[in-house]
Interface confidence: low
Amino acid sequence: RRGAPAEDQDCGRLPDFIAKLTNNTHQHVFDDLSGSVSLSWVGDSTGVILVLTTFQVPLVIVSFGQSKLYRSEDYGKNFKDITNLINNTFIRTEFGMAIGPENSGKVILTAEVSGGSRGGRVFRSSDFAKNFVQTDLPFHPLTQMMYSPQNSDYLLALSTENGLWVSKNFGEKWEEIHKAVCLAKWGPNNIIFFTTHVNGSCKADLGALELWRTSDLGKTFKTIGVKIYSFGLGGRFLFASVMADKDTTRRIHVSTDQGDTWSMAQLPSVGQEQFYSILAANEDMVFMHVDEPGDTGFGTIFTSDDRGIVYSKSLDRHLYTTTGGETDFTNVTSLRGVYITSTLSEDNSIQSMITFDQGGRWEHLRKPENSKCDATAKNKNECSLHIHASYSISQKLNVPMAPLSEPNAVGIVIAHGSVGDAISVMVPDVYISDDGGYSWAKMLEGPHYYTILDSGGIIVAIEHSNRPINVIKFSTDEGQCWQSYVFTQEPIYFTGLASEPGARSMNISIWGFTESFITRQWVSYTVDFKDILERNCEEDDYTTWLAHSTDPGDYKDGCILGYKEQFLRLRKSSVCQNGRDYVVAKQPSVCPCSLEDFLCDFGYFRPENASECVEQPELKGHELEFCLYGKEEHLTTNGYRKIPGDKCQGGMNPAREVKDLKKKCTSNFLNPTKQNSKSNS
């Protein structure tokens, strides 16, 4: 193993950890022969887990299936067989378990029904799966039931006949509110957006669909767009890609008022074989990927202004495969403004890039300390870290997990990677950053599954192996020191780690199966780390940490998007519980403005290595294809616009004469009443 010491060794004194963990390890053997297992957490901090096991035998004419349903209310330590609550019915795994939002306690399971039935069947629970009610549906569902984020009693579903069905009483009664529906989504305030086909079918009418909205669950409707190819919601933005009049290209239009008014996004149009993709969106802005023409496998990332209209080029040659639809774009949720993705270079090698300022600037990931550059590096002393994400996983490289970060584990990022000039196909190692991606260190040798517990107080890992395993590794100091714990004397074929979403739990469940000559038996081991972190953390266990600090001498050190944040973080040497109620303590302070806090407004751009915005020469004296709210519009600008989410105050204010940009609206999208409005310039 590359000369490294045996991985079963560890460091860091945690007295009697073996005895403490042995007393807190709970095994559950599932008494069935199922081929697959799915697991869902019900609610937050409830400890309730539902496990659905399915066993399917394909017969000549039909397939015979059997499901079993198990429930735990102690974070997986014990399970009870509750299959009788669903009348021993076979549950369709492709619909999964539809768990209600927040702590509603609602669960919907979709059952398999015989061929001639009038409609589908669901089992509904609103008490965290203690009881289920069987309900026969007046339609056959095509998709999983979708809960309204605002009211978990409101559900929508599409039928196999493309009907849009709505329930106002948690699936007890259903009403078909529209036919010929292709795609439906909940928006804010219980609004439903959906596209309909007018002539033939969803596929045939692609680019000729209509976008509709209902704000009262189907009593009244408004057509908010025509010639639609597709639509999406991101943050406070509603996006639609709309076919152009003259050719087969399409453009993105944006609305921030639920589709009442639309503006054409200043993004390149795309042809039939290309696509747009919303990579990330929040209340302030959006990252948009625009595919390159041809089957290149890459495109360009653009970042928007606060209106979602004006876009700045953020990153060229952004890897996004057309075939599998894979991109490595990752929001590092443990530090504001940080994103990691991959680019495809001219020689077809893939390289990782990171931004710390929400797409303003991208750079390579710093080489981990004490690491050697691999065979991909031209210069053996200068190289960078490259992160494996979705694309590597799709290519069946030895990467069991995508990068991991948690908002309440400040600064921690864990990912598989390699050190060189590009991503390597060699077996990766696991790397960790404790400062949001500025610096990295090798955490574990070889591929692992990993998860964060107790808001970063514990990191757990299991080696990725095709052999049965019985060792779990854990660290109480953000991945520096690792202890190994043998959780069972009988190794299991490992299938997954499960911990409660949100990384606040101290329990981890190790799932797998034992296999004899003809039978496979599912088993879970739940390890509770509460006795390892045996005391609650106190004030002295935390230390202050300035995020994004790169130059402590500079008064602007730590300033990102106009403000800096100081966090209280657990000391690495403190072995204590953050606890379930832990709230990240942060102290923001506003920074003075500089040109870096502004993006260039429409009609302006920043020349390479310059900080000032200058007027785009090709736009001088031209009519501009720009459509703001679809009205005749005179747009005034001084060429600068504050970056979305930027909170800087004082300092530099880019003052220059305000120009009148006469715009010509050439979009024929918009609402029928507003179409083709023009202004002469």
Partner: antibody, heavy 129, light 107 residues
Framework: QVQLVQSGAEVKKPGASVKVSCKAS????????MSWVRQAPGQGLEWMGI????????SYAQKFQGRVTMTRDTSTSTVYMELSSLRSEDTAVYYC??????????????????????WGQGTTVTVSS | EIVMTQSPATLSVSPGERATLSCRAS??????LAWYQQKPGQAPRLLIY???TRATGIPARFSGSGSGTEFTLTISSLQSEDFAVYYC?????????FGGGTKVEIK
């Protein structure tokens, strides 16, 4: 109190094997690693390897790979070190030492190496024809 | 493997004087370093771990410093019982390795 008691002195012929025992008391035997270190007459200390008494897993120095075997008996809280194919240069005092930190899996250095904090009294092994 | 080099091999010091012992690693061992004292006919005794932390029961006249590749053990005022051989040991990467030792003798 915490102590490690080793077996008595041994005289062996070249080519033979020797098995030294180290009995631990005063702490939870399976919770701490155990290293073996030897010292030839008038020479310095040489680390031979380490054993995890809980799982029984081991890691040996390359020099001793294939000749050394470290085992443990949890029922008696004893670790054993067996060295085979003895040669005259194996004449040394052999120590077991509790090593609470074990070996870092990889990557970021442990900020907490605790050292070998408890040592056995040593076992003299003489290899002579 | 990481090679640990101690200097000087022998240090002659009068009682009450200060003794400074050096240990250099062939590559960074971070702070994964320990110091031991060994007297003739006895097993080694742990003095310092983590490069700078005194082990339980070790007098305050012993102090350790350094990280990475350069380390120092300082005995601020030598007592008669301090004349012995001192070894440094790294635990950054397996195999653990010891320095050749520094013998502190009475001047």
């Amino acid at each position: 109190q915490v102590q490690l008691v080793q077996s008595g002195a041994e005289v062996k012929k070249p080519g033979a094997s020797v098995k030294v025992s180290c009995k631990a008391s005063g702490y939870t035997f399976t919770s701490q690693y155990m290293s073996w270190v030897r010292q030839a007459p008038g020479q310095g200390l040489e680390w031979m390897g380490i054993i995890n008494p809980y799982g029984g897993s081991t890691s040996y120095a390359q020099k001793f790979q294939g000749r050394v075997t470290m085992t443990r008996d949890t029922s008696t809280s004893t670790v054993y070190m067996e060295l085979s194919s003895l040669r005259s240069e194996d004449t040394a005092v052999y120590y077991c030492a509790r090593d609470p930190s074990g070996i870092a899996a990889a990557g970021p250095a442990s900020r907490y190496y605790y050292g070998m904090d408890v040592w056995g009294q040593g076992t003299t092994v003489t290899v002579s024809s | 493997e990481i090679v640990m080099t101690q200097s000087p091999a022998t240090l002659s010091v009068s009682p009450g004087e200060r003794a400074t012992l050096s240990c250099r690693a062939s590559q960074s061992v971070s702070s994964n370093l320990a110091w031991y004292q060994q007297k003739p006919g006895q097993a080694p005794r742990l003095l310092i771990y983590g490069a700078s932390t005194r082990a339980t029961g070790i007098p305050a006249r012993f102090s350790g410093s350094g990280s990475g590749t350069e380390f120092t053990l300082t005995i601020s005022s030598l007592q008669s019982e301090d004349f012995a051989v001192y070894y440094c040991q790294q635990a950054r990467l397996g195999p653990w390795t010891f320095g050749g030792g520094t013998k502190v003798e009475i001047k």
